[in-house]
């Protein structure tokens, strides 16, 4: 988790002088509770936005937006703590909005936004906005939380972000798989424009089962420059096992930008359709 290295972060708006500060996620009001605390945020919304760094890289960011309740507690509102928690790693990053002037009611509901938390493709987060000061130990909570799911690199907008492109999102191998005679599969795919090796992982399954009955790995050496964007054709020999008929072919590239962690592409061959009634055997065999 990190903040976008963007120009100076601002939270000021007409009628409010405000500054954004790094936070330890442990506001002073936890340790020194105040008697009067503001109410919780209203209508917290989290959306996926995209932002460029100063270097021109494009990253997915969490766009956080919320409004204030229209009660007198805004007179005691000194700021807000924004927290993003990556659910699996338990990594948390916080910033603090520090209000440098008192809030006053005005004709519009107060609205705040922040779009500088960089998020990772295909990851899950919890976003929390805490109004400051935080409540006394038994006081009503004055925060609102929402979970946030970042799409993976297959998502159209995500595909062109720097982290996705680094993992090979622009490569479309256009895999085709055909079943040949004598228990063989012919796999064809388009090579990317990089001299790197590939691995084909074949996993076979019985018709309605998810436990594999055959596995095979095939190494493809790095192509020469003149072979970039060309089709690579590989014939794989299957084990002759009755009913082991559903085949998943996965192609793993080893691009320099992502090494062992590049996006994999796969294609599946289903078991042949079984006719409802067996075909009758003809009484005679035609000679032509």
């Amino acid at each position: 988790l990190r903040l976008l290295d963007h120009r100076a972060l601002v939270c000021s708006q007409p009628g409010l002088n405000c500054t954004v500060k790094n936070s330890t996620c442990l506001d002073d009001s936890w340790i020194h509770p105040r008697n009067l605390t503001p109410s919780s945020p209203k209508d917290l919304q989290i959306q996926l936005h995209f932002a460029h760094t100063q270097q021109g890289d494009l990253f997915p960011v969490a766009h956080i937006e919320w409004t204030l309740q229209t009660d007198a507690s805004i007179l005691y509102l000194e700021g807000a703590e924004l927290s993003v928690l990556q659910l699996n790693t338990n990594e948390r990053l916080c910033v603090r909005f520090e209000f440098l002037s008192k809030l006053r009611h005005h004709h519009r509901r107060w609205r705040f936004t922040f779009s500088h938390f960089v998020v990772d493709p295909d990851q899950e987060y919890e976003v929390t906005v805490h109004h400051l000061p935080k409540p006394i130990p038994d006081g009503d909570p004055n925060h609102q939380s929402k979970n946030f799911l970042v799409p993976d690199c297959e998502h159209a907008r995500m595909k062109v972000t720097t982290p996705c492109m680094s993992s090979g999102s622009l490569w479309d191998p256009n895999i085709t798989v055909e079943t040949l005679e004598a228990h063989q599969l012919r796999v064809s795919f388009t090579l990317w424009n990089e001299s790197t090796h590939y691995q084909i992982l074949l996993t076979s399954f019985p018709h309605m089962e998810n436990h594999s009955c055959f596995e095979h790995m095939h190494h493809i050496p790095a192509p020469r420059p003149e072979e970039f964007h060309q089709r690579s054709n590989v014939t794989l020999t299957l084990r002759n096992l009755k009913g082991c008929c559903r085949h998943q072919v996965q192609i793993q590239p080893f691009f320099s930008s992502c090494l062992n962690d590049c996006l994999r592409h796969s294609a599946t061959v289903s078991c042949p359709e079984m006719p409802d009634t067996p075909e009758p055997i003809p009484d005679y065999m035609p000679l032509w």
Epitope: L87, N88, E124, S145, K146
Partner: antibody
């Protein structure tokens, strides 16, 4: 091929404990958390909680607090769910599923029957 | 906890029919909703995540829409393998709660 393979069916007496395992393969185990969901016979799905495979952090359904424990063994890419003080209404198929917010891969389920 | 209410609880349809299942949340959940399909004796299968994103490998006849409190799963042309029970699930706030399910039966 991502797979979650669960342990076999169990029959337990009321008051006993059960521990269900869920072995993951086909992906980096510590990249995605594991959630547990159960389904009583003929009923809908009920979220039980989750465990972070990276940090070991857990989040349990309120009504199961004190009775459920979720753990992982990263060396074997296996998640475990233990439920104690079993009651007849704990009879259900218990599923593990990958991730916290969208359950994109599921185990085949483990039937736990609680009967005296 | 956020309550999820599906309707109808069951429906009968024929192959080729357009089928619509709705799910209503007890409070605003943005687009934090998934749809699952479950066949008897099998684990659920993810169809749609974040209200409208089709999971990889799911046929294009399945689509999801909605935001806020009202959501819809549509099967544009019902196939024989689509007869199953469908569940919605919200993940805006924990605990992640499921709808009670909609059983799609053959007419």
């Amino acid at each position: 091929q991502v797979q979650l393979v669960q342990s076999g069916a169990e029959v337990k007496k009321p008051g006993a404990s059960v521990k269900v395992s869920c072995k993951a393969s086909g992906y980096a185990f510590s990249r995605f958390g594991i959630s547990w969901v159960r389904q009583a016979p003929g009923q809908g799905l009920e979220w039980m909680g989750w465990i972070s495979t990276y940090s070991g952090n857990t989040n349990y359904a309120k009504h199961l607090l004190g009775r459920v424990t979720m753990t992982t063994d990263t060396s074997t890419s296996t998640a475990y769910m233990e439920l104690r003080s079993l009651r007849s209404d704990d009879t259900a198929v218990y599923y593990c599923a990958r991730r916290f917010l969208k359950f994109d891969y599921w185990g085949q389920g483990t039937l736990v029957t609680v009967s005296s | 906890d956020i309550q999820m209410t599906q309707s109808p609880s069951s429906l009968s349809a024929s192959v080729g029919d357009r089928v619509t299942i709705t799910c209503r949340a007890s409070q605003d959940i943005d687009s934090s909703l998934n749809w699952y399909q479950q066949k008897p004796g099998k684990a659920p299968k993810l169809l749609i995540y974040a209200a409208s994103n089709r999971e990889s490998g799911v046929p294009s006849r399945f689509s999801g829409s909605g935001s806020g409190t009202d959501f819809t799963l549509t099967i544009s042309s019902l196939q024989p393998e689509d007869f199953a029970t469908y569940y919605c699930q919200q993940w805006a706030n924990m605990p992640g709660t499921f709808g009670q399910g909609t059983k799609v039966e053959i007419k």
